[in-house]
Amino acid sequence: AWELTILHTNDVHSRLEQTSEDSSKCVNASRCMGGVARLFTKVQQIRRAEPNVLLLDAGDQYQGTIWFTVYKGAEVAHFMNALRYDAMALGNHEFDNGVEGLIEPLLKEAKFPILSANIKAKGPLASQISGLYLPYKVLPVGDEVVGIVGYTSKETPFLSNPGTNLVFEDEITALQPEVDKLKTLNVNKIIALGHSGFEMDKLIAQKVRGVDVVVGGHSNTFLYTGNPPSKEVPAGKYPFIVTSDDGRKVPVVQAYAFGKYLGYLKIEFDERGNVISSHGNPILLNSSIPEDPSIKADINKWRIKLDNYSTQELGKTIVYLDGSSQSCRFRECNMGNLICDAMINNNLRHTDEMFWNHVSMCILNGGGIRSPIDERNNGTITWENLAAVLPFGGTFDLVQLKGSTLKKAFEHSVHRYGQSTGEFLQVGGIHVVYDLSRKPGDRVVKLDVLCTKCRVPSYDPLKMDEVYKVILPNFLANGGDGFQMIKDELLRHDSGDQDINVVSTYISKMKVIYPAVEGRIKFSTGSH
């Protein structure tokens, strides 16, 4: 028998520095977790102790903090090289700055293979990108070889900006021939490494003949065997065992997100490359693990540019941006309108001639808007200003909901109106009318939504049984502020871009902004 140790990360999302337990900015260093310096300490410790070790990343290193905003992927290549990653799969967020924003900073600079078998380049891009990412890579490990085959969510065109010259194929259809090719090359130990979410990971384990292990990402899935060491609740045991269609046990793993854990999986193979057994657990990277001094020093050196960036002007406002709780928790506020407009603008994807866009709606809890911005400072807006408005380091995500769920959400928005509570919703692509004289749960008297399957966008009444795409904060997608119906009833959830980054990009693009209060939210009494 031959033993392999797989160390893995996924959905790190720009958390190069250590973070607090909830993966936001580190405040009390003695309680902080993760970060590449601490990760390196643990990886090196395992490399020294064990003979056959692979360090893999399942995508979405891009996007999530000011590190990505400023360095645009150069930081990912630099620190992943420093940690000596063995391979990475492309995630959807790797395309956030377009194909060029992937090729130049990452693909050309990475000293490790970057993989995806289901992304096919066409047209002029095919020659430009050729060899910069691969469908699979055969890695020597000790005296053996291990094949790593990559995959990426086929929803990427709806979630990011891969452009028109990349085709995202069905994962299973694309993986099988590549695995077959590895088998003909006498590679008998094969890891599928990819970024399509836990459900697809399990399907790959079940359906792709010859895959021995699946290392996944995208769904931020936390798996654990035994008593979990922090706040994350396990979605299942680690590894999660899938029975393949041919009757094998195929271990499937994921390691939550944000670099908080290092996935640790030990696989025992027989002489024919079949998995005999697998066991392990994610390792919580808490403060009991010291940060590596040389990596930490490098982080501090790179950090300097971030502090300078925070105070630079992104754009100007010529109106007061009312983000006060007195406004945003009671009525339509122009800061809410600005943020929602930025959220929709960030999700413009013309992927189908029948649709002007795939999503037109935004909802945003008023309680998530934490500060106004005064225009009487020469109109200047900085990252620092936006960090006061959106201090929680969240993301603006894409969900699919039934109309009936949206209706419940808007009823919840005003179920205890007048108490300055955070659940009052700001909106984009939605016209809502409330009648507060009616009893809670029955106060929404009109709810019109902007069409997507139209050449001239207009507002139509919400249909209860129709499925709608909506952009909203991850806080709401996870049921925050009492929006349990969203969490319980959502049909799909894809995590999006860092909230501040979305708004800062929009302001930079617009240069001068003047959001108004324009009748998106209205109140009526009696018949309207």
Partner: antibody
Framework: QIQLQQSGAELARPGASVNLSCKAS????????MQWLKQRPGQGLEWIGA????????RYTQKFKGKATLTADKSSSTAYMQLSSLASEDSAVYYC?????WGQGTLVTVSA | DIQMTQSPSSLSASLGERVSLTCRAS??????LNWLQQEPDGTFKRLIY???TLDSGVPKRFSGSRSGSDYSLTISSLESEDFVDYYC?????????FGGGTKLEIK
């Protein structure tokens, strides 16, 4: 080619135990679930349980917990099922099976 | 445990006829369903795995499909050797479970 060779017919007294074997060849014995099934004359199939020889993991249908015990010997690529406290309703043909290959079955007859 | 309800339990049909057997799953089993054939001498053969994939060597007249929680085995044109017993098996979660079986008889 893949073969599952089961042991011969068993005649046993009520209350006794029998040990059925299933010798596997032509594939990696440790890396596939081995299932055991029961079929009484003229009846349908019942799924008893399965063993994963690589790590010894076993799964049983509730009804057969305590009745059947599954083991595997990696060195001889043989799976075993012991049936204990035999009663007349245990008289049946027992099959070992992979997902795509089946043994020829072992007839167990329980009679006083 | 997941219940698999197989229907019909017996079926009389003629040579060349098209027939369908159905298994209904009590819970979601995805595509984790096999169809098995048992000869009169007790030997078993898997016809279809993963709901719709034909095993090698199985004639093309056999096909598998799914509609919601209903899984079907269709034989497009019956031949004499097809008049045997058929079972579905779900392997989505332990304990695996069989349908009650269908006896296909010649009219």
């Amino acid at each position: 080619q893949i073969q599952l060779q089961q042991s011969g017919a068993e005649l046993a007294r009520p209350g006794a135990s029998v040990n059925l074997s299933c010798k596997a060849s032509g594939y990696s014995f440790t890396s596939y679930w081995m299932q055991w099934l029961k079929q009484r004359p003229g009846q349908g199939l019942e799924w008893i349980g399965a063993i994963y020889p690589g790590d010894g993991d076993t799964r049983y249908t509730q009804k057969f917990k305590g009745k059947a015990t599954l083991t595997a010997d990696k060195s001889s690529s043989t799976a075993y099922m012991q049936l204990s406290s035999l009663a007349s309703e245990d008289s049946a043909v027992y099959y070992c099976a992979l997902f795509s290959y089946w043994g020829q079955g072992t007839l167990v007859t329980v009679s006083a | 445990d997941i219940q698999m309800t197989q229907s019909p339990s017996s079926l009389s049909a003629s040579l060349g006829e098209r027939v369908s057997l159905t298994c209904r799953a009590s819970q979601d089993i995805g595509s984790s369903l096999n169809w098995l054939q048992q000869e009169p001498d007790g030997t078993f053969k898997r016809l279809i795995y993963a709901t719709s994939t034909l095993d090698s060597g199985v004639p093309k007249r056999f096909s598998g499909s799914r509609s919601g929680s209903d899984y079907s085995l269709t034989i497009s044109s019956l031949e004499s050797e097809d008049f045997v017993d058929y079972y579905c098996l779900q392997y989505a979660s332990f304990p695996y479970t069989f349908g009650g079986g269908t006896k296909l008889e010649i009219k």
